[in-house]
């Protein structure tokens, strides 16, 4: 019962986490204009992985997609890649874990296979969560570096007469969503791995021993004492570990929008 609960909870937590990773990846507010200690502008800038937006005090919001691929910073490309890998691994992990759930019966699938799949999905969730956390952290580090660089030369101009205020960017909501989502996916993955251990108890396998009694002969083949309720072979509860996590390469494309809100 506890194993089923752990597996189910791990699945739900991972599902929420992956939904969060997808949301964070699609969000426009990865970096937002720093308003602290800044002249009050009637324009608010914010940027995502796929487009940058400007919200005017008039209420109009203009978003422009990054239509170039080669012109983008390598770090941004790396963050995109990490987030997409995280989503892909998480999606595959979710698919695998659905079939691995103890509460779902699919044909005559053995518990050993379910244990395998639970472990596989758990590992996938852990890697997915780590990818998201890494992606968000790389972006956050990039922001911190740029923030202090722009602070160092915040006011530039001609002889100090005409001032140009540089726009500084700080952490956007997407970063916090990404960190939390990555953490949840990671926790879900760990829970799946723990559930897998519960699904696969250590078995004491004895070699079949023949006892020859006078008058009649009986062969005893005992199974694992935890798994079987009596003598004889109990293959239904046998656990076999063979797999590692397998990944597939997927490309996720996001449409660029140019909209006014």
């Amino acid at each position: 019962m506890a194993v089923t609960a752990c597996q189910g909870l791990g699945f739900v937590v991972s599902l929420i986490g992956i939904a969060g990773i997808i949301a964070a990846t699609c969000m426009d507010q990865w970096s937002t204009q720093d308003l602290y200690n800044n002249p009050v502008t009637a324009v608010f800038n914010y940027q995502g992985l796929w487009r940058s937006c400007v919200r005017e005090s008039s209420g109009f919001t203009e978003c422009r997609g990054y239509f170039t691929l080669l012109g983008l910073p390598a770090m941004l490309q790396a963050v995109r890649a990490l987030m997409i890998v995280g989503i892909v691994l998480g999606a595959i992990g979710l698919l695998v874990s659905i079939f691995a759930l103890k509460c779902i019966r699919i044909g005559s699938m053995e518990d050993s296979a379910k244990a395998n799949m639970t472990l596989t999905s758990g590992i996938m969730f852990i890697v997915s969560g780590l990818c998201a956390i890494a992606g968000v952290s790389v972006f956050a580090n990039m922001l911190v570096t740029n923030f202090w660089m722009s602070t160092a030369n915040m006011y530039t101009g001609m002889g100090g007469m005409v001032q140009t205020v540089q726009t500084r960017y700080t952490f956007g909501a997407a970063l916090f969503v990404g960190w939390v989502a990555g953490g949840l996916t990671l926790i879900g993955g760990v829970m799946m791995c723990i559930a897998c251990r519960g699904l696969a108890p250590e078995e004491t396998n004895y070699k079949a021993v023949s006892y020859h009694a006078s008058g009649h002969s009986v062969a005893y083949k005992p199974g694992g004492f935890k798994a079987s309720t009596g003598f004889g072979s109990n293959t239904k509860n046998k656990k076999i570990y063979d797999g590692g996590a397998r990944t597939e390469d997927e490309v996720q494309s996001y449409p660029s929008k140019h909209d006014y809100v």
Epitope: S52, S57, S58, G59, F60, T164
Partner: antibody, heavy 118, light 113 residues
Framework: EVQLQQSGPELVKPGASVRMSCKAS????????VHWVKQKPGQGLEWIGY????????KYNERFKGKATLTSDKSSNSAYMELSSLTSEDSAVYYC???????????WGAGTTVTVSS | DIVMTQSPSSLTVTTGEKVTMSCKSS????????????LTWYQQKPGQSPKLLFF???TRQSGVPDRFTGSGSGTYFTLTISSVQAEDLAVYYC?????????FGTGTKLEIK
């Protein structure tokens, strides 16, 4: 046709208050911010502030804080400006205008003339 | 507050002539987020309300004749009328739309000979 219809001229005594209206028509009132601008006779334009009819969020020019109060009423598609403790310095034409792209003002009312005189 | 300086304060021209007026801001009105200049030009004819000519420094408002051109970036902007018509008699104002409070220039009065 998009229009902003402003209330008629006001003749008020010093120290009194005045409330003028700006009725919008021809567009969705809550989708656009309404700005108020002051123009003294023969002089330039001065921005007073704006109100967002959607959420009643407002922003004021520091010079007009305590002097002007901006409100709006979604049901009547109208924006209002109340000027308090009037002095001769407040004698001017007050325009309401609709905010557009680039924070520009694309539609203007005909203006409300306020004359402060004893 | 951002100071908007317009020059000349007034100019008298004959119809068909080309006219250029300038507007200088005390700080850059260029927004790095979209590379747009938050400067607006208005025309106010005698006894009328102001009329929007250009927003984002150079984007012409619909209905504005193409003899009017807005240009410039950062802190220096110009409004050009390629061939002045009698109906262009007005005061032209530039406005900072980037920083609060929004500020207007003192205006350039265009008079026809």
């Amino acid at each position: 046709e998009v229009q902003l219809q402003q209330s008629g001229p006001e003749l008020v005594k010093p120290g009194a208050s005045v409330r003028m209206s700006c009725k919008a028509s021809g567009y969705t009132f809550t989708s656009y911010v309404v700005h108020w601008v002051k123009q003294k006779p023969g002089q330039g334009l001065e921005w007073i502030g704006y109100i967002n009819p959607y959420n009643a969020d407002s922003k004021y020019n520091e010079r007009f804080k305590g002097k002007a109060t901006l409100t709006s009423d979604k049901s009547s598609n109208s924006a209002y400006m109340e000027l308090s403790s009037l002095t001769s310095e407040d004698s001017a034409v007050y325009y309401c205008s609709r905010s557009y792209y680039g924070n520009s003002f694309d539609v203007w009312g005909a203006g409300t003339t306020v004359t402060v005189s004893s | 507050d951002i100071v908007m300086t317009q020059s000349p304060s007034s100019l008298t021209v004959t119809t068909g002539e080309k006219v250029t007026m300038s507007c200088k801001s005390s700080q850059s009105l260029l927004n790095s987020g979209n590379q747009k200049n938050y400067l607006t030009w208005y025309q106010q004819k005698p006894g009328q309300s102001p009329k929007l000519l250009f927003f984002w420094a150079s984007t012409r408002q619909s209905g504005v004749p193409d003899r009017f051109t807005g240009s410039g970036s950062g802190t220096y902007f110009t409004l050009t009328i390629s061939s002045v018509q009698a109906e262009d008699l007005a005061v032209y104002y530039c406005q900072n739309d980037y920083y609060f409070p929004f500020t207007f220039g003192t205006g350039t009065k265009l008079e026809i000979k």
